[in-house]
């Protein structure tokens, strides 16, 4: 007895595909060993056709796949475009040779069944419309026309020219003639359902002189497309239901026993289990749409169906498309925090993983919005201007080669709570969802900047200090100048670092930054933060206003620059010249519902001056104290 199990007999018809699941005992060795599918020859030799080692025979090229699901202790062999030559005896098995553990599978591929010469075969999908053509001779031009459905020996009338319609075809069947045609009539049956399948006879006239035509109607259930995705990756269901339902509400549902539970529809319904990780995007005016789900979980595996109906709910006799989603737990996408917590006034540093092979890809961070079908407008990107309302408090730090980038958001408010997505313009599977939860602060922030009303005077020296608690003693402290393309580290001086690490005086832990001499372009947002290597921690932000000291006039304390700047720090166009090579972020229009152009203003010279290159001769104005 073989411990491998599978279907002993598989039968299909030419042109179709099969998906054969083989089950193996759940052991570590079995999970990782070679899986194979071979064809049994008359000589007893079993010739490998496909294996999990990557081997694919010539006769299976472009039409077969073998996928291992170690978490289920199964592997699946998919074979498409079957021909009668595929009929034969096969083995699915495990091991380095084809003589190890295996299971015998018999595959039989038949010809598409043929009908008598006078039978016209109509093949339609569920929910579609069929037009049955009925020819007759001139002698029956004025006779009664009808279409009936064979049930055993009887033929039950579906519709006739006296305006009779069988109740089960009410509002679905019409009998008509086109133009001036005198030898043909048509019957349309719409919203096809599986029970409509069968043999129909159309007739013109009565008795022996009647003209009859046979029609075989085949109503096809949607063949589910198989989708194999990794845990924590994303999946896109591309749904094309045809122009006839272009104006009807669209939905995606998940099959559950005999119902199909709606996950999302265009009428605003959304399953709470998919909150923050789903987008429905209309593609065009012909009814095409797509549904993207990120952060795939094990429980997302199953049968999905998209459809259209005015109610936004599944309805029998309306077109559908089907998928079976498999979620592989052996994922290349690392496990990252799905919930990040912050407090008002504080900050969060969110680590976004991306495919390490695509370190040069553009990185983005967007805010998932629940309205309508869900959308995710970009807030920041490697070549995207920071969205209005986030100036001075949002930055993206790329760490090339590390397989991750960090997004920092500070000056948090409870309105920042919600779902955010990390994504790149590269591998679309690497889209991660983070839920940010912002609670009201109950204590003072860890980092505090003095002076809080920061106004520097051109030509003078200006120092700003950041106080940090002893718990950050061993971490690297930094100041950076925020601009639309990031926060560029400045040289700074750590007062606390001179002390013995044994005694830490809470009051004297300070990192300060000096601008000497102050220039007009020094105006803007500055961040004080802590980090350990590439791991960013807490940050706080301050807006430094710059003014000219007019001779003899007293120093006027302006309104709180930080309160003002949060509303509109735009009056000084600090980085105004546009770098042509970075002018536009080429975002995948399929992802973003609002396909706005995101432009990036960045002055290269300014960037050099404000970078952390203390030793360069680039007119560095931020210097050590």
């Amino acid at each position: 007895q073989s411990p491998i199990f599978g279907p002993q007999d598989v039968s299909s018809i030419e042109g179709n595909s099969v998906s054969i699941t083989c089950y193996y005992p759940d052991t570590s060795v079995n999970r990782h060993t070679r899986k194979y599918w071979c064809r049994q020859g008359a000589n007893g030799y079993c010739a490998t056709l496909i294996s999990s080692n990557g081997y694919l025979s010539k006769e299976y090229s472009g039409r077969a796949s073998l996928i291992n699901f170690p978490e289920n202790s199964t592997f699946v062999i998919n074979i498409a475009h079957l021909t009668q030559e595929d009929t034969g005896s096969y083995k699915c098995g495990l091991g380095t040779t084809n003589r190890g553990l295996f299971f015998d599978v018999s595959l039989e591929v038949s010809q598409v069944p043929e009908f008598p010469n006078d039978t016209h075969v109509y093949t339609k999908d569920i929910g579609r419309t069929v037009t049955i053509e009925c020819r007759f001779k001139e002698g029956n031009a004025h006779s009664k026309k009808s279409l009936c459905k064979k049930r055993g020996e009887a033929c039950e009338v579906v519709i006739d020219s006296t305006e009779y319609v069988d109740p089960s075809y009410k509002d679905r069947a019409i009998l008509f003639m086109k133009g001036t045609s005198r030898d043909i009539f048509y019957v349309n049956i719409s919203h096809l359902i599986p029970s409509d399948a069968g043999l129909y006879v159309c007739q013109a006239g009565e008795g022996p002189s009647a003209d009859k035509n046979n029609a075989d109607l085949q109503v096809l259930e949607p063949e589910p497309e198989l989708l194999y995705k990794d845990l924590r990756s994303s999946v896109t269901f591309e749904c094309d239901l045809g122009r006839e339902v272009a104006n009807d509400a669209k939905y995606l549902c998940r099959k559950n026993k005999e119902t199909c539970d709606v996950i999302i529809n265009t009428l605003g319904k959304r399953d709470p289990a998919f909150e923050g990780r789903i987008l429905l995007t209309p593609r065009d005016d012909n009814g095409r749409f797509s549904v993207l789900i990120t952060g795939l979980r094990k429980e997302d595996a199953g049968h999905y169906q998209c459809g259209a109906h005015s109610s936004g709910l599944p309805q029998e006799g309306w077109p559908v498309q089907a998928w079976q989603l498999f979620v592989n737990e052996e994922s290349t996408i690392p496990n990252s925090r799905s919930v990040v917590k912050g407090v008002t006034g504080g900050s969060v540093a969110i680590v976004c993983p991306y495919n390490p092979k695509e370190s040069s890809s553009l990185k983005y961070w967007c805010h998932w919005e629940a309205d309508e079908n869900g959308r995710c407008p970009v807030l920041v990107g490697t070549q995207a201007l920071v969205q209005e309302g986030y100036e001075g408090r949002l930055a993206l730090f790329d760490q090339p080669g590390s397989g991750a980038y960090t997004v920092i958001l500070n000056q948090l408010t409870t309105q920042d709570s919600g779902f955010y997505w990390c994504l790149t313009d590269g591998d679309s599977r690497w889209r991660t969802t983070i839920e940010l939860q912002v609670a009201e602060a109950t204590k003072k922030p860890d980092l505090e900047v003095t002076p809080q009303n920061a106004t520097a005077v051109i030509g003078e020296t200006f120092t700003i200090s950041c106080h940090y608690p002893c718990k950050f003693y061993s971490q690297e402290k930094y100041w950076c100048k925020w601009s639309n393309d990031g926060c560029h580290i400045l040289p700074s001086h750590d007062e606390g670092a001179r002390q013995s690490s044994v005694s830490c005086d809470q009051s004297s832990q300070i990192v300060s930054m000096t601008l000497n001499p102050v220039k007009k372009e020094d105006e803007g947002w500055y961040w004080c933060g802590v980090k350990e290597g590439q791991v960013y921690g807490e940050t706080t932000a301050i807006y430094v206003a710059v003014e000219e000291r007019t001779r003899g006039s007293p120093h006027i304390n302006p309104t709180d620059a930080n309160a003002r700047a949060k509303d509109a720090p735009e009056e000084e166009a600090m980085e105004s010249s546009v770098r042509e090579d970075e002018n536009k972020a080429n975002l995948d229009p399929r992802l973003f519902a609002d396909e706005r152009e995101i432009q990036n203003a960045g002055d290269q010279a300014q960037e050099n001056r404000a970078s952390g290159n203390a030793g360069s001769a680039g007119g560095q104005s931020g210097s050590s104290k």
Epitope: N16, Y23, K257, H303
Partner: nanobody, 126 residues
Framework: EVQLVESGGGLVQAGDSLRLSCAAS????????MGWFRQAPGKEREFVTT??????????YYADSVKGRFTISRDNAKNTAYLQMNSLKPDDTAVYYC?????????????????WGQGTQVTVSS
């Protein structure tokens, strides 16, 4: 809901044949697989055979103990599954249950099936 009604059980001699039928009614369009399990007195319910389908493709699964003797088939138009049992043995004596599933991960596992019939007794005497 899907209702399943088994028929065809009875008392036969060892070596004889028997054909069981399972008629499905209700929302049968949602079913994806139909199978047979059996339960002998004092024993657990065990997998016998299952047929699953996707469009014109059929997959037939059998327990090792019945391979080569039992054959499962279905009539789509009649929403009926059949179990042809040949070369019956006294060990085959049990109540045979028909089961239907809407989604099937492992056909051998009873809990994967959503609907069950009342069962039909098969007794094989030696």
């Amino acid at each position: 809901e899907v209702q399943l009604v088994e028929s065809g059980g009875g008392l036969v001699q060892a070596g004889d044949s028997l054909r069981l039928s399972c008629a499905a009614s209700g929302r049968t369009r949602t079913t994806y697989g139909m199978g047979w399990f059996r339960q002998a007195p004092g024993k657990e319910r065990e997998f016998v055979t299952t047929i699953t389908w996707s469009g014109p493709t059929n997959y037939k699964y059998y327990a090792d103990s019945v391979k080569g003797r039992f054959t499962i088939s279905r009539d789509n138009a009649k929403n009926t599954a059949y179990l042809q049992m040949n070369s019956l043995k006294p060990d085959d004596t049990a109540v045979y249950y028909c089961a239907a599933s809407t989604v099937l991960t492992d056909p051998r596992v009873p809990t994967e099936y959503d609907y069950w019939g009342q069962g039909t007794q098969v007794t094989v005497s030696s």
